[in-house]
Amino acid sequence: QRINTEKETLPKPIIWAKPSIMVTNGNSVNIWCQGAQSASEYQLYFEGSFFALERPKPSRSMNKVRFFISQMTSHTAGIYTCFYQSGELWSKSSNPLKLVVTGLYDTPNLWVYPRPEVTLGENVTFFCQLKTATSKFFLLKERGSNHIQNKYGNIQAEFPMGPVTRAHRGTYRCFGSYNDYAWSFPSEPVTLLITGGVENSSLAPTDPTSSLDYWEFDLSTNESGLQKDSAFWDHTTQN
């Protein structure tokens, strides 16, 4: 197991998940850790505990390894980091990678007030309701502004969008979460259409094939201003 040495350390590796950092319960996910060509060992940590290691074969001149999680569950959802060793030196820790498991327990209902088709500048609020008591709700927009909002609530949460702009148009889903990394099934999608304005268009997003596996997003909270969490931006975390 890795020994902490503060003096000489190698640059931190990059960690990311494929196909997504949001994984349906029971599905597999790959965690990639990219370090250096000369790395002799990679170690993956989960919630601060040693999870797995990989020793690349010398014949394969690769600077990254894949850790395969065969079945995602609430027990494997959480924060992952990785390290690599080259010679006698260990790298610094990668940035944290936050893996979320979805598809647990129940399915929330999502609706939009006053209606799914609104005019530019109109006030819009999304409502997410889940029969199972939960601690937090997440509203995600598919392939759009890469932005998640979350709200605390027991059975229902509301997401006021304010006066809408064209940037708000798109398809939304919501989740209830049982903790930050264990989420419900997704709601049915709700598509927000914006009419009026200069370009009189009520187009939905052009790609109708968007799915959970290809969402890229930013996790932020609207409780106390906007706090961005870089580990949820894209599927790769690096600085």
Partner: nanobody
Framework: EVQLVESGGGEVQPGGSLRLSCAAS????????MGWFRQAPGKEREFVAA???????YYAESVKGRFTISRDNAKNTVYLQMSSLRAEDTAVYYC????????????????????WGQGTLVTVKP
């Protein structure tokens, strides 16, 4: 569906040896990463040793140099050779598998394993 059946447990004196076996059903054994865990009475389950699908191994510090993990893909079996046994090695020993897996990964955390055996009891006492 993979089934794991451990055998080889029993009572042994301090300093003695035992070899545990874990027989796996199914054709997926060659693509599985395997591990041994143990749970002593009143304690949490802990990692003992693991082996990748390409025979790379890793051991808990407490058993390093005393225990050896190996696998025989032809027999769909993983072994844990235990020697220089101590009283603190007394526990129920569980075999576990990650199926499928790729590359050369050795899994150390119990959460990574998706198949478990029922366990076999090892008792070390004079």
């Amino acid at each position: 569906e993979v089934q794991l059946v451990e055998s080889g447990g029993g009572e042994v004196q301090p300093g003695g040896s035992l070899r545990l076996s874990c027989a796996a059903s199914g054709r997926t054994f060659a693509s599985a990463a395997m591990g041994w865990f143990r749970q002593a009475p009143g304690k949490e389950r802990e990692f003992v040793a693991a082996i990748s699908r390409s025979d790379d191994t890793y051991y808990a510090e407490s058993v390093k140099g005393r225990f050896t993990i190996s696998r025989d893909n032809a027999k769909n079996t993983v072994y844990l050779q235990m020697s220089s046994l101590r009283a603190e090695d007394t526990a129920v020993y569980y075999c576990a598998a990650v199926v499928p897996t790729y590359g050369n990964t050795i899994y150390v955390h119990s959460a990574a394993y998706n198949y478990w055996g029922q366990g076999t009891l090892v008792t070390v006492k004079p």
